[in-house]
């Protein structure tokens, strides 16, 4: 008895396709070993047609694939464009040779069945409507016209010209004639369901002189489109239901037991499981819309359906589209924290993954808002300036080439709590969702800047110090000047970090920044932060105002300031007078600069593919230095 299981018999029709699922026992070896599909010959040999190692035979070229789903312990063989030559005995199996664990599958491909020559076939999708054409001779023009549906024993009336209508067709069936043509009548049936499928007879007149026509109505449920997505990636369901439902409410639901549970609709309903990671976007007035889900989880796999109805809920006899979503746990998207916690007044550094093959793509960070259909306004991007209300406290640091960019938000308030998306204008699968939780601070912040009310005097020297605890001792400290294009890191010289330390005095760890001489361009936000390599940590922000010197000024005594700066310079051997010119504004502000909303984050066609670097905008350079006081006991 083979532990592999699958369908023993598969039967299909020429030109169609099959999806054969083979199930294997749940072991690590099975999950990773070679999977194959082979055809058994008369000699008992089984010739490989396709395998998970990438082998594809000539006769399957362009029409077959094999996909392993280790999380489900299954693999699927999809074969398209079937011909009668595909009829035969096959094996699906596991192992390095075709003599491993296997299961026998018999595939039979038949010719398309022929209907009697006088039968007219109408093929319609569920929820659509059909207009059946019924020709008749002129002598039957005054006679009764009717359409009936064949059952085993009789032909059950659907509608006739005396306005008799079968109860199950009330409001759905119409019998009419067009213009002055007295040789054809029409029956229109709307909101088709599976129960409407079958053989019909339309008739004009009675007895042997009656005109009859056979009709075969086929009502098809849309075949689910198979979607294979990686864990933590995103999926877009593109739903095109047609102009006739353009003004109806739209929905996406997921099959669950006996119902299809609505996940989101255009009337504001949203499943809490998808909070922060779903958008529904009406595309146009032709009934098209899309639903984007980010941060895919294993439990998101399943059978999805989109549709339209005034209630925003699934309704029989209304058009639908379906998908089967598979979520592959062997994901290329790195596993990162989906919840980031911060405290009021503190900061968070969020590492956003992107496809490393697309290091030049534009990076963005947007805040998901659930009102209406959901939307995600961009707050910052590599070529999108920081939103005004985030001035001085939000920056994006791009680290080209390593597959990660960092977004830092400081001066946190409880209002910042919510869902944020990392996205690029490249590979849309790499959209990720972060939930930011902000708790009330219960202790002093780790980084503190003195003086706190910083006003520098034009032409003089000004120093600010950033105090940090011992736990940050081994990390790199930096100062950067914030602008709405990023936070430009100032050159620093960290002497103390290279000295050996026996102990750490909590009160005396600081990194200082000196402006010498202070110019008007120095006014603005500055950040003090810590990082380890390319991994950013905590930050704190300070606004430095620049004023002209006034008599009786209560500002820091210039002599003291110079002396202090001089100490820093002597100790740190830093040339603090280096000054670089302010970087000019980037001419192309990026795709979301004017319209700052990603109303349809799923529409790649509209996304600009220019590249930029928001983390490297140059401000006027100043110096920062670190001082460490070591106490030997």
């Amino acid at each position: 008895k083979s532990p592999i299981f699958g369908p023993q018999e598969v039967s299909s029709i020429e030109g169609d396709s099959v999806s054969i699922t083979c199930y294997y026992p749940d072991t690590s070896v099975n999950r990773h070993t070679r999977k194959y599909w082979c055809r058994q010959g008369a000699s008992g040999m089984c010739t490989t047609l396709i395998s998970s190692n990438g082998y594809l035979s000539k006769e399957y070229s362009g029409r077959a694939n094999l996909i392993n789903f280790p999380e489900n312990n299954t693999f699927v063989i999809n074969i398209e464009q079937l011909t009668q030559d595909d009829t035969g005995s096959y094996k699906c199996g596991l192992g390095t040779s075709n003599r491993g664990l296997s299961f026998d599958v018999s595939l039979e491909v038949s010719q398309v069945p022929e209907l009697p020559s006088d039968t007219h076939v109408y093929t319609k999708d569920i929820g659509r409507n059909v207009t059946i054409e019924c020709p008749f001779k002129r002598e039957n023009a005054p006679s009764k016209k009717s359409l009936c549906k064949k059952t085993n024993q009789s032909c059950e009336l659907v509608i006739d010209s005396t306005e008799k209508v079968n109860p199950s067709y009330i409001g759905r069936a119409k019998l009419f004639m067009k213009g002055t043509d007295l040789t054809v009548f029409y029956v229109n049936i709307s909101h088709l369901t599976h129960n409407d499928a079958g053989l019909y007879i339309c008739q004009a007149g009675e007895g042997p002189s009656a005109d009859k026509k056979n009709v075969d109505l086929q009502v098809l449920a849309p075949e689910p489109e198979l979607l294979y997505k990686d864990l933590r990636s995103s999926v877009t369901f593109e739903c095109d239901l047609g102009r006739e439902v353009a003004n109806e409410a739209k929905y996406l639901c997921r099959m669950n037991k006996e119902t299809c549970d609505v996940i989101i609709n255009t009337l504001g309903k949203r499943d809490p499981d998808f909070e922060g990671r779903i958008l529904i976007t009406p595309k146009d007035d032709n009934g098209r819309f899309s639903v984007l889900i980010t941060g895919l989880r294993k439990e998101d796999a399943g059978h999805y359906q989109c549709g339209a109805h005034s209630s925003g809920l699934p309704q029989e006899g209304w058009p639908i589209q379906t998908w089967q979503l598979f979520v592959n746990e062997e994901s290329t998207i790195p596993n990162r924290r989906s919840v980031v916690k911060g405290v009021t007044g503190g900061s968070v550094a969020i590492a956003c993954p992107y496809n490393p093959k697309e290091s030049s793509s534009l990076k963005y960070w947007c805040r998901w808002e659930g009102d209406g259909n959901g939307h995600c306004p961009v707050l910052v991007g590599t070529q999108a300036q920081v939103q005004e209300e985030y001035e001085g406290r939000l920056a994006l640091f791009d680290q080209p080439g390593n597959g990660t960019y960092t977004v830092i938000l400081n001066q946190l308030t409880t209002e910042d709590a919510g869902f944020y998306w990392c996205l690029t204008n490249g590979d849309s699968r790499w959209r990720t969702t972060i939930e930011l939780q902000v708790a009330e601070a219960t202790r002093e912040p780790n980084l503190e800047v003195t003086p706190q009310n910083a006003t520098a005097v034009l032409g003089e020297t000004f120093t600010v110090s950033c105090h940090y605890p011992c736990k940050f001792y081994s990390q790199e400290k930096y100062w950067c000047k914030w602008s709405n294009k990023g936070c430009h890191i100032l050159p620093s010289h960290d002497e103390g970090a290279r000295q050996s330390s026996v102990s750490c005095d909590q009160s005396s760890q600081l990194v200082s920044m000196t402006l010498n001489p202070v110019s008007k361009e120095d006014e603005g936000w500055y950040w003090c932060g810590v990082k380890q390599g390319q991994t950013y940590g905590e930050t704190t922000a300070i606004y430095i105002a620049v004023e002209e010197r006034t008599r009786g000024s209560s500002h820091v005594n210039p002599t003291d300031a110079n002396a202090r700066a001089k100490v820093a310079l002597e100790e740190e051997v830093v040339d603090s007078s280096i000054s670089e010119k302010e970087n000019k504004a980037i001419p192309n502000p990026g795709p979301f600069a004017n319209e700052r909303e990603i109303q349809n984050v799923g529409d790649q066609a509209q996304e600009n593919r220019a590249s930029g670097d928001a983390g490297s905008a140059d401000g006027q350079s100043r110096s920062s230095s670190s001082k460490h006081h070591h106490h030997h006991h």
């Epitope: 369908p7 299909s12 599976h194 449920a221 075949e223």
Partner: nanobody
Framework: EVQLVESGGGLVQPGGSLRLSCAAS????????MGWFRQAPGEEREFVSA???????????YYTDTVKGRFTISRDNAETTVHLQMNSLKPEDTAVYYC???????????????????WGQGTLVTVSS
């Protein structure tokens, strides 16, 4: 809502045949799986056979090892009915046979009870001399 009604059960001698039918009414799907499970007295319910189909007319038939070659599952296209033709019956085939339906098409494991959303009340098959 889908209702499933089984019929065709009864008493048969070893080596004999029976044909079980399962009629589905209410909301029906053009792409779904219908299966047969059985439960012998004091035993757990076990998978017997299943048939999946898609609206393009492709069929997938599944059988458990113990009935392979003796039982045949089929679907009546016009009526939404599935039949299980049981030949060469053995005393160990005695059980209550349940019909089940799933609207998930050809994707879930047809042997797993949790793949099926709708269940019939069951029909008793007794194989005894």
């Amino acid at each position: 809502e889908v209702q499933l009604v089984e019929s065709g059960g009864g008493l048969v001698q070893p080596g004999g045949s029976l044909r079980l039918s399962c009629a589905a009414s209410g909301r029906t799907f053009s792409s779904y799986t219908m299966g047969w499970f059985r439960q012998a007295p004091g035993e757990e319910r076990e998978f017997v056979s299943a048939i999946s189909w898609s609206s393009d007319g492709t069929y997938y038939k599944y059988y458990t090892d113990t009935v392979k070659g003796r039982f045949t599952i089929s679907r009546d296209n016009a009526e939404t009915t599935v039949h299980l033709q049981m030949n060469s019956l053995k005393p160990e085939d005695t059980a209550v046979y349940y019909c089940a339906a799933s609207s998930s098409g050809t994707y879930g494991d047809p042997r797993s009870e949790r793949e099926y959303r709708y269940w019939g009340q069951g029909t008793l098959v007794t194989v005894s001399s």
